[in-house]
């Protein structure tokens, strides 16, 4: 469909509330340091302009693309160069290069302080101005997560508002709010990581990589739907995510709504698990579909070998309709294996493809590919064994101990990576234990490997900004589906030149005593990484002793009447002790 005014079309489709929310998210994701009030002003101006276009699509500038309109707004900010430096250089470019330039300046690790929820102050804000409260939430999440899936953020903002509607009436606001906010925070962080991986797969590996990922995932979730149906959804979903990852948030939200409508209209041929989703309002409906439970497998599934090994036309199909044939294979394999991770399914499809590529050029192809399914077993065994070993380690050490074991493992593999990144990534990798190890056997593999893909993507995104390790670059860029096996296979870096011992790194102050438990852990884990960078060959025993002594030293000083004086006296002694243990 062609419209005279794209902005008017989107405004009419989305309605004023969602339109304003999405425009706010778009500006917040691009200008991550601007104060909220500045963004509100921009949103107001864009909304007023959109309304004039709705009234008269032929009005001046209404025919301009949304990229042009948004870009012009950004470039009109007087303090752009002062606050954003070379982002202002983008303004010298024409569309579409200007928009590409803005996208490249998105910062995945902005220097923005962590949000600390204060229940009393938040309830006061909520009760004073609900609309502003909703907008502020969108702004704070969007600026910290510049690739957050915009329509999904609108959903979380509704949930956030609901939490406050309930808890601000409660006698003990904090007791009601804090656990709910924490639970929501975890969901939001997972959602951010999932979307970041989707955007990375589209941007770094192309649309086909994303389509393959989606095909496997949807085939697992909707095994009753036929290949043609799944393919249609995959194509539409790829368009939605391409738009959101590209900053086309209005189009993305509009297309996502259309896709939810299509899925609900055709739920009979897609899945039996969508009924309750489809009765919900738009944002909840889309969220519910995305999180829908796996449907039961059809009872009459035939052995895969019929179609993909025994059939005489395998090579004909492979040569004449390669992508469709491999897609059919991935669909059929995935719907039969809800227990496998998406990455594992894609690795299996890659092996199948490589085998056909080789065999179909040979004299007797069927004899050559007859045993192709036997090649899949080692691919399945590798992550299964790894998960078994790591879950046993997690059970033995607990979450904090398991995180420390991973800090040691990863610092030895890639010691060049910055200390904050190593701590963040290893801590997140360590959470796989509590997330997945308690799950039933048939859920463990997909839970663990799909979660690890999210965390390793975070490492890749951060490392790309300031590359310091060839090993990390290699694992991140060679193959999306083999990232996890690539990192697992890395051995300690024997070429690394140890860092000089810097006493300041191991200087602690009284503030350590009042920190929340997780921040205390981060301080200790930061010291552990620095220790390993100084002594990469430190033994497990030495590290355990140092950590034990550190805990005792902190406990002693935090129990002393004058914390700071104790740290000043005991700190230097502790440093001497460390050096002695590691000598």
């Amino acid at each position: 469909d062609t419209y005279k005014s794209e902005i008017a079309h989107r405004f009419k489709d989305l309605g004023e509330q969602y339109f304003k929310g999405l425009v706010l998210i778009a500006f917040s994701q691009h200008l991550q340091q601007c104060p909220y009030e500045e963004h509100v002003k921009l949103v107001r101006e864009v909304t007023e302009f959109a309304k004039t276009c709705v009234a008269d699509e032929s009005a001046e500038n209404c025919d301009k693309s949304i990229h042009t309109l948004f870009g012009d707004k950004l470039c009109a900010i007087p303090s752009l160069r002062e606050h954003y430096g070379d982002l202002a250089d983008c303004c010298e470019k024409e569309e579409p290069e200007r928009n590409e330039c803005f996208l490249q300046h998105k910062n995945d690790n902005p220097d923005i302080p962590k949000l600390k929820p204060d229940p009393v102050a938040l309830c006061a804000d909520f009760q004073e101005d609900e609309q502003k409260f909703w907008g502020k939430y969108l702004y704070e999440i969007a600026r910290r997560h510049p690739y957050f899936y915009a329509p999904e953020l609108l959903y979380y903002a509704i949930i956030y508002k609901d939490v406050f509607s309930e808890c601000c009436q409660a006698a003990d606001k904090a007791a009601c709010l804090l656990p709910k906010i924490e639970h929501l925070r975890e969901k939001v962080l997972t959602s951010a990581a999932k979307q970041r991986l989707k955007c990375a797969s589209i941007q770094k590996f192309g649309e086909r990589a994303f389509k393959a990922w989606s095909l496997a995932r949807l085939s697992q979730r909707f095994p009753k739907a036929d290949f043609t149906e799944i393919s249609k959804i995959v194509t539409d979903l790829a368009k939605v995510h391409k738009e959101c990852c590209h900053g086309d948030l209005l189009e993305c939200a509009d297309d996502r709504a259309d896709l939810a409508k299509y899925i609900c209209e055709n739920q009979d041929t897609i899945s039996t698990k969508l009924k309750e989703c489809c009765d919900k309002p738009l944002l909840e409906k889309s969220h519910c579909i995305a999180e829908a439970k796996r449907d039961e497998l059809p009872a009459d599934l035939n052995p895969l070998e019929h179609d993909f090994v025994e059939d005489k036309e395998v090579c004909k199909n492979y040569k004449e309709a390669k992508h469709v044939f491999l897609g059919t294979f991935l669909y059929e394999y995935s719907r039969r294996h809800p227990d496998y991770s998406v990455s594992l399914l894609l690795r299996i499809a890659k092996i199948y493809e490589a085998t056909l590529e080789d065999c179909c050029a040979k004299e007797d192809p069927p004899a050559c590919y007859a045993t192709v399914f036997d090649k899949f077993q080692p691919l399945v065994d590798e992550p299964k064994n790894l998960i078994k070993q790591n879950c046993e380690l997690f059970e033995k050490l607990g979450e904090y101990g398991f995180q420390n074991a991973l800090i040691v493992r990863y610092t030895k593999k890639v010691p060049q990576v910055s200390t904050p990144t190593l701590v963040e990534v290893a801590r997140k990798l360590g959470l796989v234990g509590s997330r997945c190890c308690k799950r039933p056997e048939e859920e463990r593999l997909s839970c663990a490997e799909d979660y690890l893909s999210l965390v390793l993507n975070r490492l890749c995104v951060l490392h790309e900004k300031t590359p310091v390790s060839e090993k990390v670059t290699k694992c991140c860029t060679e193959s999306l589906v083999n990232r996890r096996p690539c990192f697992s296979a890395l051995t300690p870096d024997e070429t690394y030149k140890p860092k000089e011992f810097v006493e300041g790194t191991f200087t602690f102050h009284a503030d350590l005593c009042t920190l929340p438990e997780d921040e205390k852990q981060i301080k200790k884990q930061t010291a552990l990484v620095e220790l390993l960078k100084h002594k990469p060959h430190a033994t497990e025993e030495q590290l355990r002793t140092v950590l034990g002594n550190f805990a005792a030293f902190v406990q002693k000083c935090c129990a002393a009447p004058d914390h700071e004086a104790c740290f000043a006296v005991e700190g230097p002694k502790f440093v001497i002790e460390i050096r002695g243990i590691l000598a």
Epitope: F227, N302, H306, D307, D311, K316, N317, A321
Partner: nanobody
């Protein structure tokens, strides 16, 4: 529910020609993998020819290659089998079969096709 209805069978002399038709309802024939099978008295049902859905790939059993041609008319939602140089061993009941939601003929196994017509008899005899 997909329904298939064959027509065009009959008695023909060796070396002669026949054109079978299969009218489909309940599915778009251009989006569905469709095939012709045949069953001679006392024998198993065997694959004759097939055509992919959404991808124009045709498939033939070795015994009919060069003699039979499978095609479809999307506007009429109909599948055809043009049979030339017919032989007595081509005598059988010919069935049209569909595997909706499948773009390719990835199998010649009759059991994997959920939808079948009632068949049309072709007799090749002098």
């Amino acid at each position: 529910e997909v329904q298939l209805l064959e027509s065009g069978g009959g008695l023909v002399q060796p070396g002669g020609s026949l054109r079978l038709s299969c009218a489909a309802s309940g599915a778009y024939i251009d989006e569905t993998a469709v095939a012709w099978f045949r069953q001679a008295p006392g024998k198993e049902r065997e694959f004759v020819a097939g055509i992919g859905g959404g991808v124009d790939i045709t498939y033939y059993a070795d015994s009919v290659k060069g003699r039979f041609t499978i095609s479809r008319d999307n506007s009429k939602n109909t599948l055809y089998l043009q049979m030339n140089s017919l032989r007595p061993e081509d005598t059988a009941v010919y069935y049209c079969a569909a595997r909706p939601g499948r773009p390719l003929i990835t199998s010649k196994v009759a059991d994997l096709y959920p939808y079948w017509g009632q068949g049309t008899l072709v007799t090749v005899s002098s």
